[in-house]
């Protein structure tokens, strides 16, 4: 960028040419003298450069006309090759008697405001001022390309010049290139290819896989139709015009496929009754994963290999498998699909669920009293080998004992082997309440429904026993 | 195509340290399991250990405390950090893929289901 | 630790013969079946032939094949090529233990 630097004095008030590549303020001579010295403004730095001229000042007007004011004319196309140097002008002869003149660059209809390269020289004689306004560009680009004018305005009037057209001519340049695309097999597809010069016109050749796919170029914009594929393919695109070619991006067009099977899958947390897995997916076969399938099956020999398939969205690679039986050894398998179809099920892997407390309280409890011996027998029978969710340790039996304004509860623990206890009758003449859970390590289950038992005073005997049905027997 | 190229071996005095680089292509660590194997000169295969693809590291017994396995998916690439070695740690040293992998969160275990692609190896030669 | 044993350490054999190579754990394998066989030829790394003991990977000719379960498994190759003189080694995982082994591997040369 140009820094503001003085400018000389020139000796007298008419030289010969001034070039600037800044806007000069020049004050020439009144009628009844001049002022000695040419007063610059120098634009700032990054200021925009125009041709603005102020010629003399008058401090009167002469009534005989004056013939009307236009610019020469001048080469009206200019043609050249990109990155090339360019130079042109505007020329106009002013009589000395305007005032307040000023000429600019425009280029379709806009002002010229960025840091162009305008020059005004400026030949002055006795009657009238010929400036010549040069504008050059050192490279030009294809955004040069237009319709340049030179503007004047003297006292209010505004003079403009014949365009000069310049035309920058280059290699084809792309407005539009082929994209990369995931394809279905042996399903068309449309690649589109445009470009422009000029030079025009465009012409397009298609290349697939470094082969041309059409002897006769086609006009720009070309769109290819490729009737399908059966393999991943490259495709690019030429562009040729009278200063050469030009090669487009080559872009991948994939064939979609079935997904590969998650690469990953862990076993986050485990409880009785369920399993939470996370999974890593495949490669997806250049579509998007729509949801994934968890397959699970007993790992046990014995069991009927049925499998169990909970479906999912794909995200987020997590997922809760339920209403799984406790302390159980389980084969899960998880597989994804996309549109095209259901990846290969994962390796098997191995999980097991953890032991929980028992589903359901044990049954056909019964109790009746022992008077002989002052006990309370309680039988029962353990819950479902499936229900027990775990390995038994044990039961939990509470015996609430109520008379006339006695409650007294009490608990014991009894080993797992054997369904049979003997509690201690507490109370005479009350009733006895009994309840019976299953426990495993994974905790103590549902509590039995209550029996209820009347122990007598002493004396009284009443062995008939009280107890709560099997499920199924009325 | 799908590429492994390891890198950093060479000689090294005893009690020193060394940096093995697996540089991945094709695929990308950020959804796949990678392991170490080393060989020594005339002898059969050694596992080394695994990095999945969340980061989570596990390790031969042998390997614990002295080789670390770490990566950085941004450059796609899977390091072996080797300290305190000994010239019974010459070896080719080889990274590979892990075809499948299971991860026990819960018990801190992971299983390798297969080892599917292999990069070439690099020599390292540990000896005064 | 688990171990996998390789039977024979060396094997020689010609062109065309049938030949057995035997892998035993000290324990069972993950899943029963989650034991690999590798195939190293001098200089190269080794590559993949055979998953969950039975299933050939991508590329594999069909001469290869792997049977067995729990702890003892079999690689066998029908008819022999010169392009399959090589090592193979088997190798598993176990659970509750992340380490991967190796067999010792078996070399199979020419007779």
């Known amino acids: 960028r140009e820094e503001a630097k003085p400018y000389p004095l020139f000796p007298g008030p008419f030289p010969g040419s001034l070039q600037t590549d800044h806007t000069p303020l020049l004050s020439l001579p009144h009628a009844s003298g001049y002022q000695p010295a040419l007063m610059f403004s120098p634009t700032q730095p990054g200021r925009p450069h125009t041709g603005n001229v102020a010629i003399p000042q008058v401090t009167s007007v002469e009534s005989k006309p004056l013939p009307p004011l236009a610019f020469k004319h001048t080469v009206g196309h200019i043609i050249l090759s990109e990155h090339k140097g360019v130079k042109f002008n505007c020329s106009i002869s002013v009589p000395n008697i305007y005032q307040d003149t000023t000429i600019s660059w425009w280029k379709d209809g806009k002002e010229l405001l960025g840091a162009h390269h305008a020059i005004t020289q400026f030949y002055p004689d006795d009657e009238v001022t010929a400036i010549i306004a040069s504008f050059s560009i050192t490279s030009v680009q294809r955004s040069d390309n237009g319709s340049y004018i030179c503007k004047m305005k003297i006292n209010n009037e505004e003079i403009v010049s014949d365009p000069i057209y310049i035309e920058v001519q280059g290699l084809p340049h792309f407005t539009k290139q082929p994209e990369s695309m995931n394809v279905t097999r042996n399903t068309a597809f449309n690649l589109t290819c445009q470009a422009v010069g000029p030079p025009e016109p465009v012409n397009i050749f298609w290349v697939q896989n470094s082969s041309r796919v059409n002897e006769q170029p086609e006009k720009s914009p070309s769109v290819l139709t490729v009737p399908g594929l059966t393999e991943m393919a490259v495709f690019s695109c030429e562009a040729h015009n009278d200063k050469g070619l030009t090669v487009s991006k080559g872009v991948q067009i994939n064939i979609k496929a079935i997904p590969s099977p998650p690469t990953e899958v862990s076993i986050r947390n485990s409880t009785a009754h369920s399993i939470l897995i996370s999974w890593v997916p495949g490669f997806d076969g250049y579509s998007p994963f729509r949801n994934c399938s968890i397959q699970v099956k007993e790992a046990d020999p014995l069991s009927n290999g049925s499998v169990m398939i909970f479906n999912t969205s794909a995200l987020p690679h997590l997922y809760q498998i339920k209403q799984l039986q406790a302390l159980a050894n389980y084969s899960i398998g998880v597989s994804c699909m996309n549109e095209i179809g259901w990846s290969a099920v994962s390796p098997w892997i191995l999980a097991s669920t953890t032991e929980g407390a028992p589903s359901v309280a044990p049954l056909n409890v019964t109790v009746f009293l022992n008077e002989s011996s002052d006990n309370v027998d309680i039988r029962w029978m353990k819950p479902p080998t499936k229900q027990q969710d775990g390995e038994l340790v044990g039961y939990r039996i509470s015996h609430v004992w109520q008379s006339a304004g006695i409650s007294k509860e009490l608990l014991e623990e009894v080993g797992q082997n054997g369904s049979r206890a003997r509690i201690s009758v507490q109370v005479h003449n009350a009733t006895c309440t009994v309840r019976i859970a299953a426990v495993t390590r994974g905790g103590v289950g549902p509590f039995s429904d209550p029996v209820k038992i009347f122990i007598p005073a002493h004396g009284w005997v009443d062995y008939a026993p009280s107890s709560t049905p099997a499920p199924g027997n009325a | 195509e799908q590429q492994l190229v390891e890198s950093g071996g060479g000689l090294i005095q005893p009690g020193g340290s060394l940096r093995l680089s697996c540089a991945v292509s094709?695929?990308?660590?950020?959804?796949?399991?990678m392991s170490w194997v080393r060989q020594a000169p005339g002898k059969g295969l050694e596992w080394i250990g695994i990095i999945s693809s969340s980061g989570s590291t596990y390790s031969a017994s042998w390997a614990k405390g002295r080789f670390t396995i770490s990566k950085d998916n941004s450059k796609n690439t899977m390091y072996l950090q080797m300290n305190s070695l000994r010239a019974e740690d010459t070896a080719v040293y080889f990274c590979?893929?892990?075809?499948?992998?299971?991860?026990?969160?819960?018990?801190?275990?992971?299983?390798?289901?297969?080892?599917?692609?292999w990069g070439q190896g690099t020599l390292v030669t540990v000896s005064s | 630790d688990a171990q996998l044993t390789q039977s024979p350490s060396t094997l020689s054999a010609s062109v065309g013969d049938r030949v057995t190579i035997t892998c035993q754990s000290s324990k069972s394998i993950y899943n029963n079946n989650w034991l690999s066989w590798y195939q190293q030829k001098p200089g190269k790394p080794p590559k993949l032939l055979i998953y969950d003991a039975s299933d050939l990977a991508s590329g594999v000719p069909s001469r290869f094949s792997g049977s067995g379960s729990g702890t003892e498994f079999t690689l066998t190759i029908s008819s022999l090529q010169p392009d399959d003189f090589a090592t193979y080694y088997c190798?598993?995982?176990?659970?509750?233990?992340?380490?991967?082994?190796f067999g010792g591997g078996t070399k199979v040369e020419i007779k």
């Open positions: 094709g695929f990308s660590l950020s959804s796949n399991a």
């Open positions: 590979a893929r892990v075809g499948f992998f299971v991860g026990y969160g819960a018990y801190d275990y992971g299983i390798i289901h297969r080892l599917d692609l």
């Open positions: 190798a598993g995982g176990y659970s509750g233990d992340s380490d991967y082994a």
